[in-house]
Interface confidence: medium
């Protein structure tokens, strides 16, 4: 459950993630497990530690094995294990199954494909983007944040696609490619509003104080591609991102399609180390699509320890 | 107070476009959503449609799709709404909207107006 | 989408007196989870935008007489304006935002008598 597979290729910048998750103030131990030897935290290091990243600037193939990663706190720690792997650039245009991200599918309606890992690394726009190696220009082709836009798809946009961008450290760049499939499938599906199954309104969730907590906004659309569905959390009517709390933060969580084909959408609210104040805030979880849009509220309340226990 | 301050009067020809915007004074669309309601001469008001840039995307009337572009400049707290393809019965004022939620439901927050003319 | 029909679509009221409007949605404006009627009341006086007096069919909007106010579910709504002032006329528009596009209904000229 704690060990994750990461990849890169040879000369690019691979930063990974801790696949325990800690408080910000905790500190993050990083090893080669093959050696124990503990990976230096010096930014002059080609790879180092950073919190709960560890970062290859660049990899090399010899980089590759087992990293283990021990989130310490006060009162215990946490051990995750990174198994990365470094390849040899390839010669010819192929990119082989093991470089591969998840592969993702869009219709004539959507057609977003994203940058895989793109959040863990300080890039600036804009993306370039390659379909089985070549460049994509023309109005079709849209680069818009971290995903590529493809107007009017057609089956013949299946293929492997490639984004590539450069990782800026200390005023140093360094390029990272990655690539998955795109399929094209036909549009069969329908929508309807947004229904909200998780968490119910005006729920009242049990948290205990300096402890993590999670809430997971989940709302389905319709079935089959859904031209615009979107779900996030707000807090306090505020966007998340402009609230300022570091401690409190959103994730996406999977697209899910049910084997009913209902198309759902999950957005998980991580709360580090719980204060007394987080219990004063209202918690949004909004969904929204072509129909309307549709808010869930959830209040926090404090967990009696006894309740834990029993 | 936040104000939102509209483009002033236009006078177009049909088939052509117009693009009216909407300040945010003394305030911004972050986290906002922009509605945009127009009223022909003597007529009702009429929903055209709204960017909620909380989700970063714009939801249109059916009746204007294709023919509307609602956008947002957080930078300058403006947002724009661009009409195409313009006949006679777009003549109307055309009002930017907000609401205190920043969820384009409902709106508590006018501009006061933009009359766009069409006429050959 | 969703129609909106007001009625009447005039009304003389004497000052002091009540004023009523009725706003009828074509399909049930009520979301049952949250038990909340997405609808929205306006005052709109010539060559002025319009005002927002009531939201989620019964909360008063900011500054707003409490002589004014909303009630109603599901299709049925009413405006009522307790004792007419003479800053009262003005054209009111009831709107539905469950459901994209939002739509307004023809609008309730209301006059003094």
């Known amino acids: 459950k704690f060990s994750k597979q990461s990849w890169g290729l040879e000369n690019e910048a691979l930063i990974v993630r801790c696949p325990r998750q800690g408080k910000p103030s905790y500190t993050v131990d990083w090893y080669y497990s093959q050696t124990n030897k503990s990976i230096p935290t010096q930014e002059r290091n080609r790879v180092f530690a950073s919190g709960q990243l560890l970062k290859f600037l660049p990899a090399a193939v010899a980089d590759s094995g087992i990293y283990t990663c021990i989130v310490r706190s006060p009162t215990f720690n946490r051990t995750g294990y990174a198994n990365v792997t470094i390849y040899k650039k390839q010669s010819d245009c192929n990119v082989p199954d093991y470089l591969m991200y998840s592969t993702v599918s869009g219709s004539e309606k959507n057609s977003k494909i994203y940058c895989p890992t793109i959040d863990l690394y300080n890039w600036t726009a804009p993306l370039e983007w390659f379909k089985n190696c070549q460049a994509l220009q023309g109005s079709r082709y849209r680069a818009h944040k971290s995903f590529l836009v493809i107007d009017n798809v057609m089956t013949e946009d299946a293929g492997d696609y490639t984004c590539k961008f450069i990782h800026n450290e200390n005023g140093a760049n360094y390029s990272v490619t990655a690539t998955r499939s795109f399929t094209v499938k036909d549009e069969q599906g329908f929508s309807l509003f947004p229904v909200i199954g998780a968490p119910a309104q005006n729920e009242i969730k049990e948290v205990e104080i300096g402890k993590n907590a999670n809430l997971t906004c989940s709302a389905c659309f319709g079935k089959g591609t859904q031209f615009l569905a979107a779900v996030l959390w707000q807090l306090n009517g505020t966007k998340i991102t402009d609230f300022g709390e570091p401690r409190i933060q959103q994730e996406e969580g999977q697209n899910q399609s049910f084997s009913n084909g209902l198309a759902c959408l999950d957005m998980v609210l991580r709360i580090a180390d719980v204060k007394e104040e987080d219990l004063l805030l209202q918690y949004d979880c909004l969904a929204l699509n072509l129909h309307g849009l549709r808010r869930h509220t959830v209040r926090l309340s404090r967990k009696n320890p006894i309740d834990h226990h029993s | 107070q936040v104000q939102l301050v509209q483009s002033g009067a236009e006078v177009k020809k049909p088939g052509s476009s117009v693009k009216v915007s909407c300040k945010a004074s003394?305030?911004?669309?972050?986290?906002?959503?922009v509605n945009w309601v127009r009223q022909a001469p003597g007529q009702g008001l009429e929903w055209m449609g709204g960017?909620?840039?909380?989700?970063?995307?714009?939801n249109y009337a059916q009746k204007f799709q294709g023919r509307v572009t609602i956008t947002a400049d957080e930078s300058t707290s403006t947002a724009y709404m661009e009409l195409s393809s313009l006949r006679s019965e777009d003549t109307a004022v055309y009002y930017c909207?907000?609401?205190?939620?920043?969820?384009?439901?409902?709106?508590?927050?006018w501009g006061r107006g933009t009359l766009v003319t069409v006429s050959s | 989408d969703i129609v909106m029909t007001q009625s009447p679509d005039s009304l003389a009221v004497s000052l002091g007196e009540r004023a009523t409007i009725n706003c009828k949605s074509s399909q049930s404006v009520l979301y049952s989870s949250s038990n909340e009627n997405y609808l929205a009341w306006y005052q709109q006086k010539p060559g002025q935008p319009p005002k927002l007096l009531i939201y989620w069919a019964s909360i008063r909007g900011s500054g707003v007489p409490d002589r004014f106010s909303g009630s109603g579910s599901g299709t049925d709504f009413t405006l009522t304006i307790s004792s007419l002032q003479a800053e009262d006329v003005a054209v009111y528009y009831c709107q539905q935002y469950y459901s994209i596009p939002y739509t307004f209904g023809q609008g309730t000229k209301v006059e003094i008598k």
């Open positions: 960017f909620v840039s909380l989700f970063g995307t714009a």
């Open positions: 003394g305030g911004s669309f972050s986290g906002q959503a």
């Open positions: 909207a907000r609401d205190r939620e920043g969820l384009g439901w409902y709106f508590d927050l």
